[in-house]
Amino acid sequence: ELQKDSDCCSCHEKWVGYRCNCYFISSEEKTWNESRHFCASQKSSLLQLQNRDELDFMSSSQHFYWIGLSYSEEHTAWLWENGSALSQYLFPSFETFKPKNCIAYNSKGNALDESCETKNRYICKQQLI
Amino acid sequence: ARHCGHCPEEWITYSNSCYYIGKEKRTWAESLLACTSKNSSLLSIDNEEEMKFLTAILTSSWIDVFRDSSHHPWVTINGLTFKHEIKESDHAEHNCAMLHVRGLFSDECGSSKIYHCKHKL
């Protein structure tokens, strides 16, 4: 079975490779902005979720992690860091999120909004292909 | 620098190893065989950094460490003495080791637990 490789390349040291993406799963806590800056310094971005089972490889993690979602007053919508809009199917509860807050997510598929100044763990993501 | 990986689809890569993240439960011996059938080995812990990473993403898993009895030392399936501390339970018959979010613990080899496999690149 080990011969059946995926077509994508592997990730930098201390990053997790899964389904052609690389993830940096922090063990230290930062504010949302500090987390965003750290991910950017790695030429990556805070986690942008494609679907709710994207993190099923770490489904046992107890922690909530900052992800790359913030409210745009200009667009009156929740946007990912690259400017794309949040799918309403990803977080059914997103209408209750306070626009001033930032979003933390756990690998069981739960999201919550918290003050962006709260220190949380965070996940950076790079797409390989 | 990036090197092209050699992990099967649906496995994860981390620091030059591939990991199979199991969802199914097996006894320790069954887990050993299940990993062998995937051309890999039951999860091993090489250092503190790897243990910190694994405990961040996994709830629990059998690891490749056991002992013949409570009077024997903990060894890996390769026969090497295991260096890390394994927290003992009160039960003498708990002779297989597992990784838990709070560290390494002894458990009953015949009980069914989640298992994960590892293959070094």
């Epitope: 940096f24 800056h37 750290f38 950017a40 310094s41 790695q42 030429k43 971005s45 805070l46 | -």
Partner: antibody, heavy 121, light 113 residues
Framework: QLVESGGGLVQPGGSLRLACAAS????????MNWVRQAPGKGLEWVSV????????YCADSVKGRFTISRDNSKNTLHLQLNSLRAEDTAVYYC????????????????WGQGTLVTVSS | EIVMTQSPDSLAVSLGERATINCKSS????????????LAWYQQKPGQPPNLLIY???TRESGVPDRFSGSGSGTDFTLTISSLQAEDVAVYYC?????????FGGGTKVEIK
């Protein structure tokens, strides 16, 4: 804190070895840089080395002549300058990347005071 | 490599007045996946090493007075000193850290008029 040493007067074609002693942060966690400044001129990035020391990059102007290295056990960064030319005359600063892990896409949050290298016959 | 061009080369401003320095990159330093601009500003006083003022184009470094601000995106950036103080006399450099080799602008000397 970063403190450079090893500068001085050297003839064209000669060699020097600069050192930068680091303290106050976990040295091995950060990529480190050398930046130089010719008298009365602007800043020029010279070289970077990863935290582990296994990856380096150099500016084209010094490639093949300058070598960056580090000794994490001594918290020291080095720059070996060979085949020196008059245009290498400058103050050489070591500078710390702001963010840890395997990144070179950083601004510099700490700089040393610099050491002057003069290449003249 | 990305060439950074600063203007003006020098600038004389009265105390309390606004000073504006421009920096243009030969290619965009905006990364599309995170919409971050990989640009920093440094201040260098005579006989001293550079000192970080602004990073990610607009984030002020801790301890830097709020009269310093950075703006711009893509290829065009500005450092503004809203009310020039005597201690702001220095040379100011922009730097891109989007790609290696990392490159600096040629510097802008700010003086009191």
């Amino acid at each position: 804190q970063l403190v450079e040493s090893g500068g001085g007067l050297v003839q064209p074609g000669g060699s020097l070895r600069l050192a930068c002693a680091a303290s106050g942060f976990t040295f091995s966690n950060y990529a480190m840089n050398w930046v130089r400044q010719a008298p009365g001129k602007g800043l020029e990035w010279v070289s970077v080395i990863s935290g582990s020391g296994d990856t380096t990059y150099c500016a084209d102007s010094v490639k093949g002549r300058f070598t960056i290295s580090r000794d994490n056990s001594k918290n020291t960064l080095h720059l070996q300058l060979n085949s020196l030319r008059a245009e290498d005359t400058a103050v050489y600063y070591c500078a710390k990347n702001c963010y840890g892990s395997g990144s070179y896409y950083n601004h510099f949050d700490y700089w040393g005071q610099g050491t002057l290298v003069t290449v003249s016959s | 490599e990305i060439v950074m061009t600063q203007s003006p080369d020098s600038l004389a401003v009265s105390l309390g007045e606004r000073a504006t320095i421009n920096c243009k990159s030969s290619q965009s330093v905006l990364y599309s996946s995170n919409r971050m601009n990989y640009l920093a500003w440094y201040q260098q006083k005579p006989g001293q090493p550079p000192n970080l003022l602004i990073y990610w184009a607009s984030t002020r470094e801790s301890g830097v007075p709020d009269r310093f601000s950075g703006s711009g995106s893509g290829t065009d950036f500005t450092l503004t000193i809203s009310s020039l103080q005597a201690e702001d006399v220095a040379v100011y450099y922009c730097q891109q850290y989007y790609s290696i080799p990392l490159t600096f602008g040629g510097g802008t000397k700010v003086e009191i008029k």
